[in-house]
């Protein structure tokens, strides 16, 4: 039986190569895809009790979360 996509890379293996511009890292299958294929959680209203994810740098420097949306930089990918 095919293993799940999350099982293809061992926890101790090197982190994937950072995505090129206009691509974002899909956390669920662990590879780079066009940013528009992914969806981040809805933006929080001002004053929400839980902090929003930190804003990412350029997509090639971080894990993107979709064009024009906040994303979460993942140090292991930098």
């Amino acid at each position: 039986m095919r293993r799940g996509p999350r099982s293809l890379r061992g926890r101790d293996a090197p982190a994937p190569t950072p995505c090129v511009p206009a691509e974002c890292f899909d956390l669920l299958v662990r590879h780079c895809v066009a940013c528009g294929l992914l969806r981040t959680p809805r933006p929080k209203p001002a004053g929400a009790s839980s902090p929003a994810p930190r804003t990412a740098l350029q997509p090639q420097e971080s894990v993107g979360a979709g064009a024009g949306e906040a994303a979460l930089p993942l140090p292991g990918l930098l």
Partner: antibody, heavy 117, light 111 residues
Framework: EVQLVESGGGLVQPGGSLRLSCAAS????????WNWVRQAPGKGLEWVGY???????YYNPSLKSRFTISRDTSKNTFYLQMNSLRAEDTAVYYC???????????WGQGTLVTVSS | DIQMTQSPSSLSASVGDRVTITCRAS??????????MHWYQQKPGKAPKLLIY???DLESGVPSRFSGSGSGTDFTLTISSLQPEDFATYYC?????????FGQGTKVEIK
């Protein structure tokens, strides 16, 4: 806002087949992750599987041999084909859309599947 | 598969009480510095509702009395002051590894 509407549930005999549909509006099923989750009467939630933006599917291994998820992008609808149904497959079946982290933030209303002779 | 164990399975509480539900994973659900742990509320006859994602992020529209914490294998959902509409069943879920799995649920009942 994503809206999901399931259909296709009903009574089926053991060994029979059924196809559930989940019609999505508010976002394209070619974006993100689209799940099926089921809940047997009085029991907890069980993830069935997903189909993602590229059409890649992944299933709960306990169900994979009998259940298949597919999609029709022209209808913005995805499906759960269930074969060789058993009494223990009796459940409410929900479709749900996952966010960037896999959390399911939009759910359908559920459709009841009853497997009984 | 990652097994999710919630405790308690049920609890009785009064309006205004502080309620804590725990969820333990059989292995870490953290990766890339993220906890792939989420919490849902479900009322009878209704679909589940996402409360908390990524262990501690409050879903839009969810009251601030709900909070989540934890990392690795141990996680907590806290309701700071229980309200009448909070009597329901709560589930944790991990999406760190396929197959995604849920806890068995914690039913919060009126004392």
């Amino acid at each position: 806002e994503v809206q999901l509407v399931e259909s296709g549930g009903g009574l089926v005999q053991p060994g029979g087949s059924l196809r559930l549909s989940c019609a999505a509006s508010g976002d394209s099923i070619t974006r993100g992750y689209w799940n099926w989750v089921r809940q047997a009467p009085g029991k907890g939630l069980e993830w069935v599987g997903y189909i993602n933006y590229s059409g890649t599917t992944y299933y709960n291994p306990s169900l994979k041999s009998r259940f298949t998820i597919s999609r029709d992008t022209s209808k913005n609808t995805f499906y759960l084909q269930m074969n060789s149904l058993r009494a223990e497959d009796t459940a409410v079946y929900y479709c749900a859309n996952s966010n960037f982290y896999g959390a399911m933030d939009y759910w359908g209303q559920g459709t009841l599947v009853t497997v009984s002779s | 598969d990652i097994q999710m164990t919630q405790s308690p399975s049920s609890l009785s509480a009064s309006v205004g009480d502080r309620v804590t539900i725990t969820c333990r994973a059989s292995e870490s659900v953290d990766d890339y510095g993220i906890s792939f742990m989420h919490w849902y509320q479900q009322k009878p006859g209704k679909a589940p509702k996402l409360l908390i994602y990524r262990a501690s992020d409050l879903e839009s529209g969810v009251p601030s009395r709900f909070s989540g914490s934890g990392s690795g294998t141990d996680f907590t959902l806290t309701i700071s002051s229980l309200q009448p509409e909070d009597f329901a069943t709560y589930y944790c879920q991990q999406t760190s590894k396929d197959p995604w799995t849920f806890g068995q649920g914690t039913k919060v009942e009126i004392k």
